[in-house]
């Protein structure tokens, strides 16, 4: 209730002599600060002085000063919500009640706290799962109501007297509501820590034993098991008996039933701990063991590989791989039951032995054609000689052999024709399926390995075949030899090298760029005119009507070509120049004259000067010049000049007459 | 060095005759290399040739198409000058007026082209 | 007659950049184009005389390229002088025409 004050601190304390003890405390008081504190040893209220007798273990005055006697107990608390106490060393005499009496200004109040103080250490306690099994990890944890900053300690787990190796963790509690120092360590026990001791050891600071706790491992575990076989290398032939015992080393709880297996399946009807074995036959080769069963689960013994010993049986081979590519490698396996096994082999191909094959695999790097066949075997070990086998078939496969491409047309072949060729080869694993041809074009195929090409091309060099089954085997290329007309027949300017001006030297050559057969003829003409049969044309000195179209013909015994139409261009000055007049050569003054330069040049006239009578030059640099108005004095000579790239030329002198007007003749 | 000075009105009414003078110093105007031209500008129609005179032998005249009919440029060798009379004006014709020098002649043995080289200072002319 | 048509008509620039201006005759005027400069209230001035031949006096960082009908002024590195208003004209034949002008301005 609210008249109370309110304290938090453990109940009892733990300690024992020469220990100490710390007491973790918190308080509120009904109001105001603490003003005095007593601690004391087993109080007592006295009725008649109202006042609590006792022991006084520490005393607090107004001025906060302790007495030197008072050094063992020491207050760590402060005067409104700490009450922690030490106590170092503590005694036995110790032991009973602490009464913790509290003063403010206008409340008092007597908190009692039990401390128990042993002899020596008490030792920690072992707490264990309620069950342990073998490899199930388990936490052991080791308890111990004691700490205090002032006195280290520590525990340590031992097996059967030796620390573990595992790491344990420990921790420690200081608080109001508990004081504790614990130790936890995981382990997976196996069955053979079944009955072990495990000690939680208390140690001082210096590792000296001060106390300790121990418990007896109970590991709950499968039954283990050893198995004995007489006789002991567990090998005998057919008929020979085999005896196989079965014991217990330990079981967890006790065992309940007994069965034995071979090869993991359980024999019918065997129960006991002994398995009796007559006349064994092959079949009952194999892996033995027993299992006995408990609580927890089976346990099974080591396995007891049972051998028992015959010849050869008839053997099988095994390919790897049929059918095999040419090339390629192969493996054979002689497969054989025996035992023990077999020692030497003897193989057979089509019947027939191979010389120094003895071992069980035979290993062919590189397959040919003439390793195929049947492959068989005979398997030996020292109770006896096996049986042949029936023997497997390897299939070797190639590509098509000796592969040619043969032209069934007569010789020679012209551009034009049908040609007809076959592709033939000489064998072939597996059989022939397609060709193929080389190079592709939209040829006919009438039957399988003939190839017809429908108007045979110049360019047709060569044809090449392919036989195919899984690959495709190339012949070597046939030539055509396609005789054809000579082909991309043009004409080139050998000289000059630049443009044609009038008066160069100039040769003219007919190109072509192939011809079969290679003996041409050549014409040249132009504008249908026969000029030369030379493959060039020259002039020694062009002039402008050499101009025009050129062809050249290449022919052979096959055909003619001819070339495109070839201009030749002459550049040349402007030439034939004169002036012309409009209206006329006679104008009235007053009106307009124009004087037109006519020339002939090429390229055409760029710009052109014109002149009078004193070879003065007029500003006027096109085709026409305008005199308007004329005027009388303007009779006279003009001529022209007409620039091109090439150079210049001049017209003659041509008269203009400009004539008086009727006004100015009827002015005079 | 050659210079072109131009005198003459700033101000001519319509329907009169505007006439400028372009006195050359440092050449000839009968110089045989050279024509003599009157030249215009206004916002409107930008620079616009109005004609020239020119001595070859004889004197020449050239006209534009767009004034042919009311124009008329002589030359004056005794006052080496050229002069532009342009009749019948109207508010068209208001324009800033240029003479130039246009490189362009000589004989056939010593040509010349060198462009309108030299060019007066201008005179404003509103027809109003 | 003979058109010439400039272009651009006008051109926003800085000094130091390289300007080019076109001028297209409307038939072929061999070489017979000049290049004229004009600033405001003052007569033009020559810079180029047949197409290329620079004018006596004029900066070498003006040239002119071209024949027949496409002709070129180029100012190499534009100085601020040179913000003005240029004009091509050809003396093929009469009458003499000029182009509508080019306006160099400064960015």
């Known amino acids: 209730d609210s008249s109370k004050w309110v304290f938090e601190h453990p109940e009892t304390l733990y300690a024992w002599e020469g220990a100490c003890v710390w007491i973790p405390c918190t308080y509120r008081a009904l109001d105001g600060d603490l003003e005095s504190f007593i601690l004391f040893h087993n109080p007592e209220y006295n009725k008649n002085t109202s006042k609590f007798d006792g022991t006084r273990l520490y005393e607090s005055t107004k001025d906060g000063k302790v007495p030197s006697e008072q050094k063992r107990v020491q207050f760590l608390g402060d005067k409104n919500k700490n009450c922690t106490l030490s106590i170092h060393p503590v005694h036995l005499n110790d032991s009973g009640q602490l009464g913790l009496r509290m003063e403010s200004k206008t409340e008092k109040w007597m908190e009692r706290i039990h401390l128990n103080v042993s002899e020596r250490p008490f030792p920690p306690h072992i707490q264990l799962p309620p069950e342990i099994q073998e490899s199930q990890e388990v936490t052991l944890t080791c308890l111990l109501n004691f700490s205090c900053y002032g006195y280290p300690i520590q525990l340590q787990w031992l097996l059967e007297g030796v620390p573990m190796r595992q790491a344990a963790v420990t921790s420690t509690s200081l608080t109001i509501k508990s004081v504790f120092t614990r130790s936890e360590l995981k382990f997976s026990p196996q069955w053979s820590h079944h009955g072990k001791i495990v000690t939680c050891q208390l140690q001082d600071a210096d590792g000296k034993f001060l106390s300790n706790d121990t418990v007896q491992l109970n590991v709950k575990h499968t039954p283990k098991l050893e198995i004995k076989v007489t006789p002991s290398d567990a090998i005998v032939r057919e008929g020979d008996s085999v005896t196989m015992t079965c014991e217990v080393s330990s079981s967890n709880p006790e065992y309940t039933t007994v069965s034995w297996l071979k090869d993991g399946t359980s024999l019918k009807k065997q129960n006991t701990f002994t398995l009796n074995l007559r006349e064994v036959t092959k079949d009952q080769s194999g892996k033995y063991c027993c299992q006995v069963s408990n609580d927890v689960g089976p346990g099974r013994s080591e396995e007891v590989f049972l051998q028992v010993q015959y010849a050869p049986e008839p053997s099988t081979v095994q390919i790897l791989h049929s059918p095999a590519v040419e090339g390629s490698q192969v493996e054979f396996l002689c497969m054989s039951l025996a035992n023990p096994l077999p020692t030497n082999y003897t193989w057979y191909h089509n019947g027939k032995e191979m010389q120094g094959r003895t071992e069980e695999k035979v290993h062919i790097p590189k397959i040919l054609p003439w390793h195929a066949g049947t492959y068989s075997c005979v398997a030996e070990n020292i109770l006896g000689t096996g049986q042949r086998g029936p023997g497997a078939e390897l299939d070797v496969q190639y590509p098509p052999k000796k592969v040619t491409t043969v032209i069934q047309n007569p010789m020679p072949i012209r551009e034009g024709d049908t040609v007809t060729l076959s592709c033939n080869y000489n064998s072939s694993n597996p059989s022939v399926t397609r060709y193929e041809w080389k190079p592709h074009g939209a040829w006919e195929e009438p039957s399988l390995g003939v190839l017809k090409i429908q108007n045979v091309g110049w360019d047709n060099t060569t044809i090449a075949c392919a036989a195919c089954n899984s690959w495709c085997s190339w012949a070597s290329p046939v030539a055509l030899n396609v005789q054809y007309a000579p082909r991309d027949v043009r004409v080139r300017k050998i000289k000059p090298l630049s443009e044609i001006h009038s008066g160069n030297s100039v040769s003219l050559q007919c190109d072509f760029s192939s011809s079969h057969p290679k003996e041409v003829q050549f014409f040249w003409e132009k504008n249908g005119r026969l000029l030369g049969k030379e493959s060039q044309l020259n002039f020694d000195s062009i002039s402008p009507e050499d101009a025009g179209s050129y062809s050249c013909w290449v022919n052979n015994s096959i055909g003619q070509t001819a070339s495109k139409a070839w201009t030749l261009e002459v550049l040349y000055a402007p030439r034939r120049l004169r002036v012309s007049m409009s209206p006329g050569d006679q104008v009235m003054e007053g009106k307009s004259a124009t004087l037109t330069c006519e020339s002939d040049a090429n390229p055409p006239v760029s710009h052109y000067t014109w002149f009078d009578w004193n070879n003065q030059s007029l500003p006027y640099h096109s085709q026409k010049l305008r005199l308007e108005p004329v005027k009388v004095q303007h009779s006279g000579a003009y001529w022209c000049q007409g620039t091109n790239s090439v150079g210049k030329g001049r017209s003659p002198l041509s008269t203009l007459t400009v004539y008086y007007s009727p006004e100015t003749i009827g002015r005079r | 060095q050659v210079q072109l000075q131009q005198s003459g009105p700033g101000l001519v009414q319509p329907s009169q005759t505007l006439s400028l003078t372009c006195v050359i110093s440092g050449d000839s105007v009968s110089s045989n290399s050279a024509t003599w031209n009157w030249i215009r500008q206004s916002p409107s129609r930008g620079l616009e040739w109005l004609g020239r005179?020119?001595?070859?032998?004889?004197?020449?005249?050239d006209y534009a198409v767009s004034v042919k009919s009311r124009i008329t440029i002589n030359p004056d060798t005794s006052k080496n000058q050229f002069s532009l009379q342009l009749n019948s004006v109207t508010p068209e014709d208001t324009a800033v007026y240029y003479c130039a020098r246009d490189g362009d002649g000589g004989s056939y043995y010593d040509y010349y082209y060198y462009g309108m080289d030299v060019w007066g200072q201008g005179t404003t002319v509103t027809v109003s | 007659d003979i058109q010439l048509t400039q272009s651009p008509s006008s051109l926003s620039t800085s000094v130091g950049d390289r300007v080019t201006i076109t001028c297209r005759a409307s038939?072929?005027?061999?070489?017979?184009l000049n290049w004229y400069q004009q600033k405001p209230g003052k007569a033009p001035k020559l810079l180029i005389y047949a197409a290329s031949n620079l004018q006596s006096g004029v900066p070498s960082r003006f040239s002119g390229s071209g024949s027949g009908t496409d002709f070129t002024l180029t100012i190499s590195s534009l100085q601020p002088e040179d913000f003005a208003t240029y004009f091509c004209?050809?003396?093929?034949?009469?009458?003499?025409?000029f182009g509508q002008g080019t306006r160099l301005e400064i960015k």
């Open positions: 005179t020119y001595y070859r032998s004889k004197w020449y005249n």
């Open positions: 004209q050809q003396s093929y034949t009469t009458p003499i025409t």
């Open positions: 038939q072929s005027i061999s070489t017979y």
